[in-house]
């Protein structure tokens, strides 16, 4: 190459189809054969083209056709008389990738090719999208500017044609302008929200735009608020209602999760309260849903959850009513005897001593969610309840000696069963049988019977002596013996008796005593009067 | 002088991968304003364009059968290698390599081309 | 996709004859058609780029004209080595698509 003439310009230039691209250029020739005076053309070629023949793509010489492909659409802008060959490319199309030369003419020496420093012209898709700028969360009623930007913008190139459109703008929406950049005022409703807004930016050839939708975030305050509840890890239900409030059942020692979630804009602060205490809260940018866990759910976690969410434009609540179901627990049985307000707890297998006669209340006492069914049997037999609409309680107004045995108090329920025992002993005073006596060879042999509860204890008394035992001189002997609820004691009395003297049998327990006398008389064929005392 | 040569499998299987190369010379694929295309022919049917790479290593390919392709280039061996994923019996064609005049997407030099059989 | 139409998919002519191949294109091209010539058992070989310019070293005989959507090939006189398979070509958008072709035979 002749080093007089030089170009600058750069090896590729790519845009993007359909929009327009200005390419620098600079070059330089010698001073030879021409003036001031003399015209300087400048032509662009494809290199496919044969200079001669073929039309350039675009020229400074008025009189020389140019591609048909490239009229109106390639222009020389450069003084190729200044050394400028820049040329604008406008609605790039794929046909226009190629390798292009510049050619200088001026006077009769210089005419240059400069074949081998052209640039090669690389047409792209279109995919570049124009930027919108618009705050974050939009107030509804409060005017807002969105800017759109395309960020592609040449010395010689013709603005694009912008373009708005979306439900939050007026049915008609926007007049297009033309400039780098569009400005469009609006005042979001509250419907706004969640909607596209989008801005167009349409290039010269038809069918060649871009565009960037963005949704709209208007302000509101939280609704749609849901509760669900997720038990055992398994996935979240929603509770079912029951009333106004939702109501769930969870039993004893499962694992519960409540989530609560809220529509709002901006983000609601999402707390959980049980009656009104924070069991937890989330900040607005913090996750979604908030949980609560339950791990092993307990009794006491039974009550009123509700989450509450809240942001500067208002709040909203939902409730939960969490019954946790278990079965009986700690069964016993409460006594309350002869009238006596005071009740002792009992629990299984306690023996429980009661004076016949006396009124006894028995009350069946056990905590169970729901209400355990209760009910007492005696012996097997299920006893009717004194109560029905308390059927743990069973009143005895006066305990016979029959109703001694074992009560069982049973708790039956879905979770599980349990039962709680006691042992009912009837207490009396002693019942005296005798004395009665029988004279025999060897002297007067009487014996005397009582039954009490506890098992009476019986003493033989003659006039103003206890008779203990056997007698030194041998004079009496005692023989004491008992079953059960029965005391026997046989007297033989030996030797002579003095006339007028009384005999008598005293039986007694804790409850009291009872007493029978014989008087004695001096026939020893007669009869043997009784006397009894208490 | 500009030359194109086509190689790969005469005889692929469905589902199989097709990997054909193209060794070229007479020319740098390093040099602006180069670029590659293959072109497909079923027999007795039309050429259809599959894909394209410049010399910056800047890929172009037919939508249509986008998921299947990629072409790449290996510049100092003067190669260029095209895959196609999943072939099916209608894939049956002469693969053609070509180059576009001064960068022009119409096409002065092709290769002999290769006859690739997709059959089970 | 743009779609490139051949008529006749069959052409009977005599040598010395002139032949007139057309082509549509589904939408508007510009002048990014190109022509090509195929024999049997050989590549395709460029003869027009651009609608109407002739490439280097291809016979005056073939001429290349329209814009739009309607091209045609002109053969003024044919020669036995022109008897092949002529396809047409758009560039003017994403994907290159040719035609189905036409059969030029000797009648």
């Known amino acids: 190459m002749d080093g007089r003439f030089w170009i600058r310009v750069q090896e590729s230039v790519m845009v993007p189809e359909g929009l327009c691209i200005s390419v620098p250029c600079s070059f330089s020739y010698p001073r030879q054969d021409w003036t001031g005076s003399t015209p300087a053309y400048g032509y662009w070629f494809k290199a496919v083209t044969e200079t001669t023949k073929g039309a350039p793509v675009a020229t400074n010489h008025q009189s020389r056709e140019v591609e048909m492909s490239t009229r109106g659409r390639f222009q020389l802008t450069g003084d190729p008389a200044k050394g400028n060959c820049s040329l604008v490319i406008r609605d790039a199309q794929m046909q226009d990738e190629s390798q292009y030369f510049f050619r200088v003419e001026r006077g009769s020496y210089v005419r240059y090719n400069f074949m081998n420093d052209g640039f090669f012209l690389k047409v792209t898709a279109l995919t570049q999208k124009p930027d919108v700028y618009i705050p974050e969360t939009l107030e509804p009623g409060q005017p807002v500017t969105v800017i759109c930007v395309f960020n592609w913008a040449f010395e010689e190139c013709p603005p694009p044609s912008f373009s708005w459109t979306g439900a939050a703008l007026s049915s008609q929406g926007t007049k297009p302008t033309t400039s780098h950049f569009s400005v469009l005022s609006f005042t979001p409703r509250p419907q706004d929200h969640n909607t596209d807004l989008t801005c167009h930016v349409d290039f010269s050839r038809k069918g060649v735009s871009a565009q960037r939708t963005v949704r709209l975030r208007v302000a509101y305050a939280p609704r749609d608020l849901v509760i669900s509840i997720s038990r055992d890890n398994t996935p979240a239900l929603e509770p079912q209602p029951q009333g106004n409030v939702p109501y769930l059942e969870a039993q004893k020692g499962q694992f519960l999760r409540l989530l609560c979630a809220a529509d709002s804009q901006p983000p609601a602060t999402l707390s959980w309260v049980l009656q009104n205490r924070v069991l937890s809260s989330s900040h607005p940018w913090g996750p979604r849903p908030l949980g609560l866990e339950l791990p092993g759910v307990k009794a006491g976690d039974s009550g009123r959850y509700t989450c509450r969410a809240e942001n500067r434009l208002g709040s909203q609540q939902r409730a939960l009513d969490l019954s946790v179901q278990y079965p009986p627990e700690n069964l016993r049985v409460m006594v309350s005897q002869a009238n006596r307000t005071v009740l002792e707890n009992l629990g299984n297998g306690t023996s429980l001593p009661v004076l016949e006669g006396q009124s006894l209340c028995l009350v069946c006492v056990t905590h169970s969610s729901p209400p355990a069914r209760l009910s007492w049997t005696q012996r097997g037999q299920v006893l009717s309840p004194s109560q029905p609409s308390d059927p743990g309680v069973l009143e005895l107004p006066r305990v016979q000696v029959e109703h001694e045995g074992e009560f069982t108090c049973h708790a039956r329920h879905p979770l599980g069963s349990q039962h709680v025992s006691l042992s009912l002993s009837v207490h009396y005073s002693p019942k005296l049988l005798g004395p009665s006596c029988s004279w025999e060879a060897e002297g007067l042999h009487c014996s005397c019977s009582s039954q009490a509860s506890p098992a009476p204890s019986l003493r033989w008394w003659l006039g103003e002596e206890l008779l203990e035992g056997n007698s030194s001189q041998d004079s009496f002997e005692v023989t004491p013996s008992s079953a059960g609820p029965w005391a026997n004691s046989s007297l033989s009395l030996h030797g002579g008796l003095s006339s007028g003297l009384r005999l008598r049998c005293e039986a007694w327990n804790v409850h009291g005593a009872q007493s029978g006398s014989i008087l004695q008389l001096p026939d020893k064929k007669g009869l043997i009067s009784t006397a009894f005392s208490n | 002088q500009v030359t194109l040569k086509e190689s790969g499998p005469a005889l692929v299987k469905p589902t199989q991968t097709l990997t054909l190369t193209c060794t070229f010379s007479g020319f740098s694929l390093s040099t602006s304003g180069m670029g590659l295309s293959w072109i497909r022919q079923p027999p007795g049917k039309a050429l259809e364009w599959l894909a394209h790479?410049?010399?910056?290593?800047?890929?172009r390919y037919n939508p249509s059968l986008k998921s299947r392709l990629t072409i790449s280039k290996d510049t100092s061996k003067n190669q260029v290698v095209l895959t196609m994923t999943n072939m099916d019996p209608v894939d049956t064609a002469t693969y053609y390599c070509?180059?576009?005049?001064?960068?022009?997407?119409?096409?002065?030099?092709w290769g002999a081309g290769t006859t690739v059989t997709v059959s089970s | 996709d743009i779609v490139m139409t051949q008529s006749p998919a069959t052409l009977s002519v005599s040598p010395g004859e002139r032949a007139t191949l057309s082509c549509k294109a589904s939408q508007n091209v510009g002048t990014a058609v190109a022509w090509y010539q195929q024999k049997p058992g050989q590549a395709p070989r460029l003869l027009i780029y651009s609608a109407s310019n002739r490439y280097t070293g291809v016979p005056a005989r073939f001429s290349g004209s329209g814009s739009g959507t309607e091209f045609t090939l002109t053969i003024s006189s044919l020669q036995s080595e022109d008897f092949a398979v002529y396809f047409c070509q758009q560039y003017s958008s994403y994907p290159l698509t040719f035609g189905g072709g036409t059969k030029v035979e000797i009648k």
């Open positions: 790479i410049y010399w910056d290593d800047d890929k």
């Open positions: 070509v180059r576009g005049l001064y960068g022009n997407w119409f096409f002065d030099v």
